[in-house]
Each structure stands twice: as structure tokens, then as C-alpha cells.
């Protein structure tokens, strides 16, 4: 055989590839040891070109051989050298949180280690190192911001190698924001279970709004302004139901295009679709999602696509919101009315997430063009939205 | 102003290769999903393939589908087709063109054209 | 893929006449339908998009209708730079495809 690599290396694994010997072989035989480890030998099929090598010691160089037999036969050795990576430390843990201290504790990794590299980052973006001792299995962190959520990492070191980070989160105590003006907020206050929570506009007590929450997909901490899923709700509405919104918030509904004008002017915001149909999912998000005042008829601004839904929503960015009574979209005919809802019309759709619950001729129904195209009412729909910064904070609702 | 100039056109034989450009400027070109349309000698427009302003998705016409791959490298403001067993009827004027802001397969902004002739 | 039909093929018109030349597509596409205007030798410009909206910077002579499969440009006064030739195009599935043209020449 010739070639001989590994791939995959892990702290406790590596694969091991060659190139077959030209001639037909019978069998493979493959040795690996390395420093204090005894010698393995395997033998394998002559039609094999790859072996996992397995139970391997974390931060050893191993060195790899192996030759060809066909019957009593032996092709020459050849031989590759490779070193496993160091293993993590284990079951990292913040206790004793208090205002501004908390103890990190953890286990130490199978390998030797010549110390610990500690980072503990604020939701502000602080960020603290500290490096440790070989020894050490605790640390006590000081001079922590009450009321805040922190990402504490570590690190083994050995010489030159670094294993993986492992991670805890933790909050001090405290409330972050006694007048959430989002779910997001919500969420940072500690609140970490989806459902209906009152937020307030601009931070003001007197601009209370009852929201749904959704703290899960993605990181959460998303308000949700949509949601299709039964049809039991009526979206062939007037503008004045499409301006104040309308349903149930715990079902189907319609947050109001002024909640949503007043939300996404406190700041920069994402959007976040998620639609379902039997059984299979797709999502979108935008990095900036707003909407305009009444007076520009509540325009709207989405850009920055990703997501596995594909981008329907770049046809209507810019456009002015429609309904059947008020007519502002690009079309010769009133899209609203032709459709039978209500969206960000052009001319007409390519988004249709106010049409009529399970309606399967073009166009009329929950459509999601670049996903279902338009002949398929999709089941299931969720417009929602929250900061734009908040993937910085990402899984920082964790307990420690 | 915005403007694109395709290169790169010229006589190949059947079954070689050929490799289109397209310089853009006047415009922010990593918004924008570019395309290439052909036109055959004295007959119609037909679309070829697209790319998305990213360049993460592609799109191709049947007919150079395996054969044809579109790309651009947005540092540079370029668009490429790289040409593969050529045929016969793949003997037009190569446009390249510019997608429209929200509906890129609207094609607002054309350049001046490439000829590319298969032909032994 | 959806094919768009054009016609007439040809349409010899006189200075100052209305044109109307019509686009069919084989499928619904709600308002995804686009014109351009060639003139010989040149690239193709694009005239109307989304049916009905004209492009930046084109004569107000021109006007498109229509939605779902049957679709209209109109020249309301055919002037002597208008001789060209006209194609639909498709914008709402790829591939995207275009009409086989209609010329208009001076009759």
C-alpha cells in the first residue's frame, strides 16, 4: 500500500486512509502505538482502504504502520506519524452566584496539562482571560456586573496544544430590565419559557404590550407578529384590523402594523420566518426588518437573507402595505382583493402569509413562493422578530 | 454610471472550452444576482443561467446544464462563464446582465455582448 | 418550463399609430412579466417590469397591463426611434424565459 494519511483527529480518534496496494491483496495488517501506550494490532479485509482507530490517549503522538499479506506474502511498511488532540476539561459549572461573584468549577482532562485558559465574557462584550494552574479545578470570579448574563469558557493547555472550549452560562442576580421592550429583554431578564409576556415600548411602563414570546428557535427571545395554523382566524381584514392587529395571541393572529412600527423604530431588528408542513421545515431570516409609520403606509425594509426557505421576501421590500380597502401596491389590480388578504404587495406576491388558510389555488392561499410555490397553502406560519445584535447573545438564556 | 463589459468571446471548436468575463462597476455588485443571456445569430433571447448576489445559489438552462458553470468573485466586480463541450448551437452573442434590486430575475442593466462562434 | 407566446410576429406601423402587442404564458404568473426593446446591433433595454411599471427613464408613450397569463405593451404614438424589436420575458420561475419577438418596422 502507499499514501498512508489520517484524517478526523479527535482527542481520542483518528481514521486512518491508504492507497491499495497495486496487486490484489488478502489482508491488511495495522499496528499503532505511542508513548506509554502499548501496541495495537489490527487486522483488516485486503479490499479495505480506511480503519478507525479508536480509545486512543488525548495529546500522544502515535505512530501508525502498516504493510500488505497475501498468503505468506508481506509487502514492505509504511509509516505515518500523528498526534491526538488534547482533551477538554469536563463539567464546567458556575455556583455561588451571587450580585458580582460566581464559582466556576470543573473537572480535569485525561491528559496531562500545564494549565487552564479561563475566558468569562459579559453580554456588554467584556471580556476577561485568566490563565491558571495545572492543579486547579476552581476559580473564583469577582467584580462582576449584577444583573448580567455571562459565557465563561476554559480551555486545557499543554505547551503548544489547546483542547476544545467548553462552556457554561450564568446570570447574576438582579433584574436587567424592569420594563422589557422586547422579548429578547424578556429573555435577559431570566424568562426563558415561550409563551405571552407584556413588554413596553420604549422601555415606558404607560406603553404596556401583551406579546408572544417564542424563547426557543434560534436562541429565542423573538416577538412574534404572525401566526397561521388552523385557519380558525378571519386575515381578509380592512386596514384599520391590519393597523391595530387582531386574533388571539396564543393562536392565530395579527400583531398590528403599528406595534410594529413602534417596535422595530426602538432599535435594529431581524426577522425570522418559520413555516411547517407535513412534517418538513424551512425558515428565513432577514438582519434588518422594519416598518414605516402610517404615513409611508407602513413600508417595509428587509434585507440580508439567509435561512432554507428560500428569499421570497426580497420581492416586497420597500413596498407599502395593502389591503383590500387600501390600495398601495404596483399592480393594476388591488392584490388584496384579487388574493384575498393582506401583505406588502407588488405586483402581486411571492410571500402570501396572510392569504387564506388552505386554499390551493395560485396564489390565494399561505404561500411561501420560493418554498411551496403557489400552489400549496403552507400549515404552519410564524413571522417574528427581535434585535439584530441578539446572535451575539446567543444560548446566554442557559442556566449554569 | 453602471455598465458591464463582457470579454472573452471569440472561434472555438466543438467540444473545446471558452471562459466568459463580465467587469461591473457603477453599482454595489455583491446586492445584485447577475445572469447570461444569449441571442443566436437572427433569432430570440433566451436566459442561460444566474447566480445570486452571494454567489451561494446557481441556475442553469437545461440545454448547458453539466456543461456550463457560472461564478463570480465579488472582490473583483466579475462575473464568469466557463464554457465546457462546446456545441454547434452554442454559437450566439453571450450577454451579461444585471438582476433587479429585489426580483433578480429581472434583468434592468445589460452589457454590450461577446460573440462566441462554435465552429470546426 | 413556462412558455411565453408572443404576436404578431411582425407589425409594419406607420409614425404616430398606436401599437399594442400581446404576451401569453402558458402558465399562471400572476404580474412577473417583463419587456425589453432590441434595437439592431444592440443590447436589449429594459422597458416595463412587473406588467405594468415603467422603467426609470422610459417614455411615458410606453404602457404595460395585464396579469395571470394574457399581458399588453402598448406604444400609445409610435415614434421614429420605437422601431425595434419587442420581447416578454417571464420573471416568476426559472428558468426564465422570453417571448420569440415581435418587430416593429415602418410600415
Known amino acids: 500500500p502507499s499514501g498512508l494519511v489520517t484524517a478526523n483527529i479527535t482527542d481520542s480518534e483518528a481514521l486512518a486512509r491508504w492507497q491499495p496496494a497495486i496487486a490484489t491483496v488478502d489482508s491488511y495488517v495495522i499496528s499503532y502505538t505511542g508513548e506509554k501506550v502499548p501496541e495495537i494490532t489490527r487486522t483488516v479485509s485486503g479490499n479495505t482502504v480506511e480503519y478507525a482507530l479508536t480509545d486512543l490517549e488525548p495529546a500522544t503522538e502515535y505512530t501508525l504502520r502498516i504493510f500488505a499479506e497475501k498468503g505468506p506474502q508481506k509487502s514492505s511498511t509504511i509509516t505515518a506519524k500523528f498526534t491526538t488532540d488534547l482533551d477538554s476539561p469536563r463539567d464546567l459549572t458556575a455556583t455561588e452566584v451571587q450580585s458580582e461573584t460566581a464559582l466556576l468549577t470543573w473537572r480535569p482532562p485525561r491528559a496531562s496539562v500545564t494549565g487552564y485558559l479561563l475566558v468569562y465574557e459579559s453580554v456588554d462584550g467584556t471580556v476577561k482571560e485568566v490563565i491558571v494552574g495545572p492543579d486547579t479545578t476552581s476559580y473564583s470570579l469577582a467584580d462582576l456586573s449584577p444583573s448580567t448574563h455571562y459565557t465563561a469558557k476554559i480551555q486545557a493547555l499543554n505547551g503548544p496544544l489547546r483542547s476544545n472550549m467548553i462552556q457554561t452560562i450564568f446570570t447574576t442576580i438582579g433584574l436587567l430590565y424592569p420594563f422589557p421592550k422586547d422579548c429578547s429583554q424578556a429573555m435577559l431578564n431570566g424568562d426563558t419559557t415561550s409563551g405571552l409576556y407584556t413588554i413596553y415600548l420604549n422601555g415606558d411602563k404607560a406603553e404596556a404590550l401583551e406579546v408572544f414570546c417564542d424563547m426557543t428557535s434560534d436562541g429565542g427571545g423573538w416577538i412574534v407578529f404572525l401566526r397561521r395554523k388552523n385557519g380558525r382566524e378571519n386575515f381578509y381584514q380592512n386596514w384599520k384590523a391590519y393597523a391595530a392587529g387582531f386574533g388571539d395571541r396564543r393562536e392565530e393572529f395579527w400583531l398590528g402594523l403599528d406595534n410594529l412600527n413602534k417596535i422595530t423604530a426602538q432599535g435594529q431588528y431581524e426577522l425570522r420566518v418559520d413555516l411547517r408542513d407535513h412534517g418538513e421545515t424551512a425558515f428565513a431570516v432577514y438582519d434588518k426588518f422594519s416598518v414605516g409609520d402610517a404615513k409611508t403606509r407602513y413600508k417595509l425594509k428587509v434585507e440580508g437573507y439567509s435561512g432554507t426557505a428560500g428569499d421570497s421576501m426580497a420581492y416586497h421590500n420597500g413596498r407599502s402595505f395593502s389591503t383590500f380597502d387600501k390600495d398601495t401596491d404596483s399592480a393594476i389590480t388591488n392584490c388584496a382583493l384579487s388574493y384575498k388578504g393582506a401583505f406588502w404587495y407588488r405586483n402581486c406576491h411571492r410571500v402570501n402569509l396572510m392569504g387564506r388558510y388552505g386554499d390551493n389555488n395560485h396564489s390565494q392561499g399561505v404561500n411561501w413562493f420560493h418554498w411551496k410555490g403557489h400552489e400549496h397553502s403552507i400549515q404552519f406560519a410564524e413571522m417574528k422578530l427581535r434585535p439584530s445584535n441578539f446572535r451575539n447573545l446567543e444560548g446566554r438564556r442557559k442556566r449554569a | 454610471q453602471v455598465q458591464l463589459v463582457e470579454s472573452g468571446g471569440g472561434l472555438v471548436q466543438p467540444g473545446r472550452s471558452l471562459r466568459l468575463s463580465c467587469a461591473a462597476s457603477g453599482f454595489t455588485f455583491d446586492d445584485y444576482a447577475m445572469h447570461w443571456v444569449r441571442q443566436a445569430p437572427g433569432k430570440g433571447l433566451e436566459w442561460v443561467s444566474g447566480?445570486?448576489?452571494?454567489?451561494?445559489?446557481?441556475y442553469y438552462a437545461d440545454s448547458v446544464k453539466g456543461r456550463f458553470t457560472i461564478s463570480r468573485d465579488n472582490a473583483k466586480n466579475s462575473l464568469y462563464l466557463q464554457m465546457n463541450s462546446l456545441r454547434a448551437e452554442d454559437t450566439a452573442l453571450y450577454y451579461c446582465?444585471?438582476?433587479?434590486?429585489?426580483?433578480?430575475?429581472?434583468?434592468?442593466?445589460w452589457g454590450q455582448g461577446t460573440m462566441v462562434t462554435v465552429s470546426s | 418550463d413556462i412558455q411565453m407566446t408572443q404576436s404578431p410576429a411582425s407589425l409594419p406601423t406607420p409614425v404616430g399609430d398606436r401599437v399594442t402587442i400581446t404576451c401569453r404564458a402558458s402558465q399562471y404568473i400572476q404580474g412577473f412579466l417583463n419587456w425589453y426593446q432590441q434595437k439592431p446591433g444592440k443590447a436589449p433595454k429594459l422597458l416595463i417590469y412587473d406588467a405594468s411599471n415603467l422603467e426609470t427613464g422610459v417614455p411615458s408613450r410606453f404602457s404595460g397591463s395585464g396579469s395571470g397569463t394574457d399581458f399588453t405593451l402598448t406604444i400609445s404614438s409610435l415614434q421614429p426611434e420605437d422601431f425595434a424589436t419587442y420581447y416578454c420575458?417571464?420573471?416568476?420561475?426559472?428558468?426564465?424565459?422570453f417571448g420569440q419577438g415581435t418587430k416593429v418596422d415602418i410600415k
Open positions: 420575458q417571464q420573471s416568476y420561475s426559472t428558468p426564465q424565459t
Open positions: 446582465a444585471k438582476g433587479q434590486k429585489g426580483e433578480g430575475d429581472t434583468f434592468d442593466i
Open positions: 447566480i445570486s448576489g452571494s454567489g451561494g445559489s446557481t
